[in-house]
Amino acid sequence: SEVEYRAEVGQNAYLPCFYTPAAPGNLVPVCWGKGACPVFECGNVVLRTDERDVNYWTSRYWLNGDFRKGDVSLTIENVTLADSGIYCCRIQIPGIMNDEKFNLKLVIKPAKVTPAPTRQRDFTAAFPRMLTTRGHGPAETQTLGSLPDINLTQISTLANELRDSRLANDLRDSGATIRIG
C-alpha cells in the first residue's frame, strides 16, 4: 500500500523522499515518475537526477530541498485534481538489484472556500509530517504526528521553513533515511 499525502487545488504538493549520500557530493541517480514504480527506473518520468545534477525535469515539478545532501523530495507546483495519483521515487543505488523504490499516493482536494480572511490555512493537510522508512517491499511509513496548531504569525515562519527545507532536514535528522555506503 502507498503512503498517502494530501494537498488542495492551487497549493504546492510535497512528496518526501530522502537518502544519505555515502560521501558529500557522491550522488546517486534518482527518478520521479507519475504512476507506481515499474520494474526498472520510472515510468512517465517527471524529474530525474544523475550523479551531479538535475538532468531532466518538466514544468511544475522541482526539488525544493538540497538534493546534493540526499533530499530528493518532489514539489508539484499549483496542483490540480489531475495531479492526483501514485508517484514513484526511485533511488538507483549502485550494485546488483539495489534500487530503493517508494510509491507515494497524492490526493488532491478541492480548494476550501475561505469565508473570512483570518481563517487559518490547513498546512497539515498540505505538508503532512510523514516519512518513508527503509524497506524492500511496499513502502513502509511512520507518522510523526500532526504539526502543532499554528497561528497567523507562525504561517510565514512555516512557509519559510518549508521553502528552506528545514522540515526536510528535520525528517532526515530523524534517522529514517536511506543510507548508502
Epitope: V39, F40, E41, G43, Q92, I93
Partner: antibody, heavy 117, light 107 residues
C-alpha cells in the same frame, strides 16, 4: 539510423564462456537502461539482464545470476554480456534491447549462442 | 514472479478479420503491459506500451486495452503482414516476464 547490432555468439561447450557485444548507434546510449533478452529455439522470450544508463546498477534473472555479468562502455556505445559456466539450457538467440518508458522499444537482430558438446 | 498467460496460444484468421488476443497477469500490474510482434527469424517489435499507448509508426488497426490483471490486443482488420507471433510482457514487478506467445496464422 537508430540501431543495435549484436555479435559474439557461437558454439561453446558446457561449462565454457562467451562474451556478447551489442553496438548501439543513432541515440544517446548513456541515457538508456539496456537489457538482454533471450529466446530458446522454438520457444518464447525470456528476460536475462539489465543495466542502468551509468552502468552502476545491474539486474539479473535467477536463472543466470552468478554466471552472467552485464556491463557497458558508454564511451564506445557498447553493451556486453559475459557468460560463464554455460549450460545446454542457455542455448538461445540473445537480443540486446533498449528499455524506455517501461517497454523494450528497440531490439537488435540477435546472435545465436549454442551450448553443446 | 508474475505469470503472464496468453490466450489463445494459436489462432487462425483471414485477411480482413478482426481478432482479439488476451493476456492475464497473476497479480495486479497497473497498466504496465506491453505488446510485441515477432515474425520468424526476426527480433520482436514493440507495438503497444502502457496497455493502450500505440508506438509511433504502428498502424491504427492495432489497439490495446485493460488494466490490473486483464488485457487485450485487438487487430481490427488483419493485413497479410500481421500474421506473426504476439507476446505480452509485464513491466510492473521484477523480473519482467513475457506471456508464452500467441501465433496468428492465415486460415
Amino acid at each position: 539510423e537508430v540501431q543495435l547490432l549484436e555479435s559474439g555468439g557461437g558454439l561453446v561447450q558446457p561449462g565454457g564462456s562467451l562474451r556478447l557485444s551489442c553496438a548501439a548507434s543513432g541515440f544517446t546510449f548513456s541515457s538508456y537502461y539496456m537489457s538482454w533478452v533471450r529466446q530458446a529455439p522454438g520457444k518464447g522470450l525470456e528476460w536475462v539482464s539489465a543495466i542502468s544508463g551509468n552502468g552502476k546498477s545491474t539486474y539479473y534473472a535467477d536463472s543466470v545470476k552468478g554466471r552472467f555479468t552485464i556491463s557497458r562502455d558508454n564511451s564506445k556505445n557498447t553493451l556486453y554480456l559475459q557468460m560463464n559456466s554455460l549450460r545446454a539450457e542457455d542455448t538461445a538467440v540473445y537480443y540486446c534491447a533498449r528499455y524506455y518508458n517501461t517497454g523494450f522499444d528497440l531490439w537488435g537482430q540477435g546472435t545465436l549462442v549454442t551450448v553443446s558438446s | 514472479d508474475i505469470v503472464m498467460t496468453q490466450s489463445p496460444s494459436s489462432l487462425s484468421a483471414s485477411v480482413g478479420d478482426g481478432v482479439t488476443i488476451t493476456c492475464q497477469a497473476s497479480q495486479d500490474i497497473y497498466n504496465y503491459l506491453n505488446w510485441y510482434q515477432q515474425k520468424p527469424g526476426k527480433a520482436p517489435k514493440l507495438l503497444i506500451y502502457y496497455a493502450s499507448s500505440i508506438v509511433s509508426g504502428v498502424p491504427s488497426r492495432f489497439s490495446g486495452s485493460g488494466s490490473g490483471t486483464d488485457f487485450t490486443l485487438t487487430i481490427s482488420s488483419l493485413q497479410p503482414e500481421d500474421f506473426a507471433t504476439y507476446y505480452c510482457q509485464q513491466a510492473s514487478s521484477f523480473p519482467p516476464t513475457f506471456g508464452q506467445g500467441t501465433k496468428l496464422e492465415i486460415k
